[in-house]
């Protein structure tokens, strides 16, 4: 129950041993009590004891004092438990009875007789203090006291507030007299179920499951979770925010694993060679004459420098070398010729010019060939033109440098910032922070590299028509429809077919005239360009060694808008007609000028959705036909092409889908 009405019987006096009817008890009044507790009544009436009733065993004969007894029969005070909110008022009827029968259960005996009764009506507040009273009539006197207390775990003025002290997963508290919770030390909250963390524990980065604890969230460490943890791959770096890798002094690279002072720390170069802190391993050895090898550890043969000219063969001798000259040549290095132009000495289409009144000659070699007789194929890579560990490649009449990650430029001489590697997915903005890239993610994405999508799927509603494939965009409500052949529009809702009343003849004539005009302009421009072009190597290499195929496949820079000067894309599909597929999903942070490429490869035929023009969105390029070749060349210093990737297609029927 929620509370207990307690009645303590103290003394009963019936000196003459009389019953209520005036008769006397023989041999004396063996007295027990019946107690009835009910709701307040102005006039006490018979009827059920609504708040409870209780009987005692025989407590004495005639007059007696009632002792307190806590257990068993004859318990005193008497307990009347109730299971409701105590109303504050009551009616109490106490009756004294005489029984001739059993002492322990007298209320069941026949022949019981009433000795006296008292009725108490009034108000009584819950409390521990006993209210004492005494009732007299002509024959008897009863002394007693009573009170109402709350049962265990019940509190408040009416015992209506339940509170059970606990110290477990659901709470850590004791109960105050009014029933409110009093948290145990180290706990807080409405139900005292929240631990008070270690003093100073960082509010966002730390938490606790028990008092005076400070457990760090991922990316944080230390007693108060106020120190970040560097990136997993970081080697010689620290952080100011989690997963960063800001290099210690003397270290570089994305994971601070490149020793910027390798030469000083390790002295790797042998035999008096010069060490420089560059190259793929963090150092490069420049050997003295007569030595070779990565660390200049190998001695060269005297013939290693190829001293014999005109096809002469070299033989090593103890301290020098000897050239065996082919027919028609003589001299220490076979440098003198006995031939003339009449002997047709120039190979590979070289033209012969007579010198010294016909006693000697000189060969003028076509591109790609060299040597006094044009007998050697040009290797433009012999001079090691590629810096920073770039790989030199002979490509027809020119050479190109294939740069290591982190470098660019004609000779790989330019260092790209870490952000140029585009570490941020989904259009995240990259910031270079002390050698470590940090991504600021757009709405709807999170994670160190913005790789985690945290919003609902904009494609879930199926916004694309005509069997188009839907891709979610950058912001939560963005989506992109990739239309099947024959449909266009931001939702692929428009078929490509033209209206029936289309004036075909007029349009055909108009288009024909426009095409003729364009061809005429192109011829004029081509002729002018040919006149302006210098034939020497320098001008040929000025465009970052573009192959002819690549030069033919450039979109004028005016049609592209560069919004991120750091971003570069290198796509090399090779010179064969291979299927480039999705171009490795390289994402450019550029805005595509409206109408650059509609579907079907016709610039500006169908306008893009207005929504896509004003905001940064990823542009993914992929060939939809295996015959298509997409070339893309970037040069950050090439002002002619405005530091953007110029992309084009080989054939008109090839389609480059632009998902914007």
């Amino acid at each position: 129950g929620s509370g207990i009405f307690q009645l303590r019987l103290q003394e009963f006096v019936n000196q003459r041993g009389m019953l209520a009817n005036g008769q006397s008890c023989e041999p004396g009044c063996r007295t027990f009590f019946r107690i009835c507790l009910k709701h307040f009544q102005a006039t006490f009436s018979e009827g059920p004891c609504t708040f409870g009733n209780v009987s005692t065993p025989v407590l004495g004969t005639n007059s007696f004092v009632v002792r307190d007894k806590n257990s068993g029969s004859g318990r005193n005070p008497l307990q009347l438990p109730f299971n409701f909110t105590w109303p504050g008022t009551f009616s109490l009827n106490i009756q004294a009875w005489h029984t001739p029968g059993d002492d322990l259960r007298p209320e069941t005996s026949p022949g019981n007789s009433l000795i006296s009764q008292i009725i108490i009506q009034g108000s009584l507040a819950v409390g521990k203090i006993w209210r004492t009273d005494e009732q007299n009539d002509t024959l008897t006197r009863l002394s007693y006291s009573y009170r109402v207390i709350c049962s265990d775990n019940y509190y408040g003025e009416s015992c209506s507030r339940l509170c059970k002290k606990r110290d477990d997963h659901f709470g850590h508290y004791e109960c105050q007299p009014d029933g409110s919770l009093s948290c145990l030390p180290g706990w807080t909250g409405k139900y005292c179920d929240q631990p008070i963390c270690l003093s100073g524990c960082h509010e966002q980065n730390g938490y606790c499951s028990k008092p005076d604890e400070c457990i760090c969230r991922p990316g944080w460490q230390g007693r108060l979770c106020n120190e970040c943890i560097p990136h997993n791959g970081c080697r010689h770096g620290t952080c100011s925010i989690p997963w960063q890798c800001a290099c210690d002094e003397g270290w570089g690279g994305l994971f601070c694993d490149q020793d910027l002072n390798y030469c000083t720390h390790h002295s790797p170069c042998k035999n008096g060679s010069t060490c420089s802190n560059s190259g793929p391993k963090g150092y490069t050895c420049t050997c003295l004459p007569g030595y070779t090898g990565e660390h200049c550890e190998l001695g060269l043969s005297k013939c290693a420098s190829n001293p014999c000219r005109n096809g002469g063969s070299c033989k090593d001798q103890e301290n020098s070398y000897h050239c065996l000259c082919p027919p028609g040549y003589y001299g220490q290095h076979c440098e003198h010729s006995t031939l003339t132009c009449a002997d047709s000495p120039c190979f590979n289409g070289g033209s012969c010019r007579e010198r010294n009144q016909g006693s000697s000659y000189a060969c003028e070699c076509p591109p790609n060939f060299t040597g006094s007789n044009c007998e050697k194929k040009v290797d433009r890579c012999t001079s090691n033109p590629c810096a920073n560990g770039g790989q030199c490649q002979n490509r027809g009449p020119s050479r190109t440098c294939r740069c290591r990650p982190g470098f660019t430029g004609t000779h790989c001489e330019l260092h790209i910032s870490d952000c140029a590697r585009s570490p941020c997915a989904h259009g995240g903005t990259c910031h270079d922070l002390e050698n470590g890239p940090v991504c600021t993610c757009p709405a709807g994405f999170s994670g160190r590299r913005c790789e985690v999508r945290i919003t609902h799927d904009a494609c879930a509603s199926g916004p694309c028509f005509n069997g188009a494939t839907c891709y979610t965009g950058l912001s939560p409500n963005n989506f992109v429809c990739n239309c099947p052949y024959g449909f266009v529009g931001s939702r692929c809702e428009f078929p490509v077919g033209l209206p029936p009343s289309f004036p075909w003849v007029a349009v055909s004539l108009g288009v024909g005239l426009v095409v003729l005009l364009v061809l005429l302009v192109m011829v004029v421009v081509a002729v002018r360009q040919l006149r302006l072009r210098r034939p020497d190597d320098e001008s040929r290499e000025a465009m970052n060694n573009l192959s002819d195929f690549q030069k033919d496949n450039l979109i004028p820079a005016a049609q592209l808008k560069n919004t991120n000067q750091k971003k570069e894309l290198e796509v090399d599909c090779g010179l064969d007609k291979s299927n480039c597929g999705k171009l490795q999903n390289h994402t450019l942070d550029y805005n595509l000028a409206p109408g650059l490429l509609g579907r079907g490869g016709m610039p500006g035929k169908y306008p893009h959705s207005d929504k896509s023009l004003g905001e940064k969105v990823p542009l993914r390029l992929h060939s939809e036909k295996p015959e298509c070749r997409i070339s893309a060349i970037c040069s950050p210093r090439d002002s002619m092409y405005q530091s953007v990737c110029l992309i084009s297609e080989e054939r008109n029927e090839c389609v480059i889908a632009t998902e914007v």
Epitope: C216, P218, R223, E227, P230, R235, T238, G447, E451
Partner: antibody, heavy 118, light 107 residues
Framework: EVQLVESGGGLVQPGGSLRLSCAAS????????MAWVRQAPGKGLEWVAT????????YYRDSVKGRFTISRDNAKNSLYLQMNSLRAEDTAVYYC???????????WGQGTLVTVSS | DIQMTQSPSSLSASVGDRVTITCRAS??????LAWYQQKPGKAPKLLIF???ILADGVPSRFSGSGSGTDFTLTISSLQPEDFATYFC?????????FGQGTKLEIK
């Protein structure tokens, strides 16, 4: 190249003590939190203890609390695990690893075997 | 403690096969999950962290996905050197806990 080399393992009687060491190289040791992870023979992996990089805050799994102590000496690029009151269930290969209790373990040593048996 | 349950416990496959291993957490661990590869007598090697980020030097045939309680490790085309035991690990709650492992064997 990151290298973590454990030592100090061996056979010990129940109730005995052992001190494991881990020598680190190839990275700036003082910048990174470190941990011990163990693997009972033929069983899975179990995190044992962690120590932060700068203030040396330590955390332990409940079953080793009060018996094991993790510590570090940044000047010596070394991590330690003092194991007291050893029990048979502590028998395992003990790995030194770079990481915290709330991060992946990026680099691991080759491990050292601790056998607790009478 | 968070329980990590891997399935299957063992798996036979051939070179070139596509293989998927799953890992289930007893509570939501957000994206704080890593995958390790362990060869007999060797230390584990970190493959993937934060559910889907490849660790330095790990081949791109390995990929991870999932969030919350269900995660997968996929090897797109098995190579001979990929036969090993794979473990998942959560680091969202203390203590960090590992899966029991999936042994990948040659068929």
């Amino acid at each position: 190249e990151v290298q973590l080399v454990e030592s100090g393992g061996g056979l010990v009687q129940p109730g005995g003590s052992l001190r494991l060491s881990c020598a680190a190289s190839g990275f700036t040791f003082s910048n990174f939190p470190m941990a011990w992870v163990r693997q009972a023979p033929g069983k899975g992996l179990e995190w044992v203890a962690t120590i932060s990089s700068s203030d040396g805050t330590t955390y332990y799994r409940d079953s080793v609390k009060g018996r094991f102590t993790i510590s570090r000496d940044n000047a010596k690029n070394s991590l330690y695990l003092q194991m007291n009151s050893l029990r048979a269930e502590d028998t395992a290969v003990y790995y030194c690893a770079r990481g915290y209790y709330n991060s992946p373990f990026a680099y691991w040593g080759q491990g050292t075997l601790v056998t607790v048996s009478s | 403690d968070i329980q990590m349950t891997q399935s299957p416990s063992s798996l036979s496959a051939s070179v070139g096969d596509r293989v998927t291993i799953t890992c289930r957490a007893s509570q939501d661990i957000y994206y704080n999950l890593a995958w390790y590869q362990q060869k007999p007598g060797k230390a584990p090697k970190l493959l993937i962290f934060d559910t889907n980020i490849l660790a330095d030097g790990v081949p791109s045939r390995f990929s991870g996905s999932g969030s919350g309680t269900d995660f997968t490790l996929t090897i797109s085309s098995l190579q001979p050197e990929d036969f090993a035991t794979y473990f998942c690990q959560q680091y969202d709650y203390v203590p960090p806990t590992f899966g029991q492992g999936t042994k990948l064997e040659i068929k």
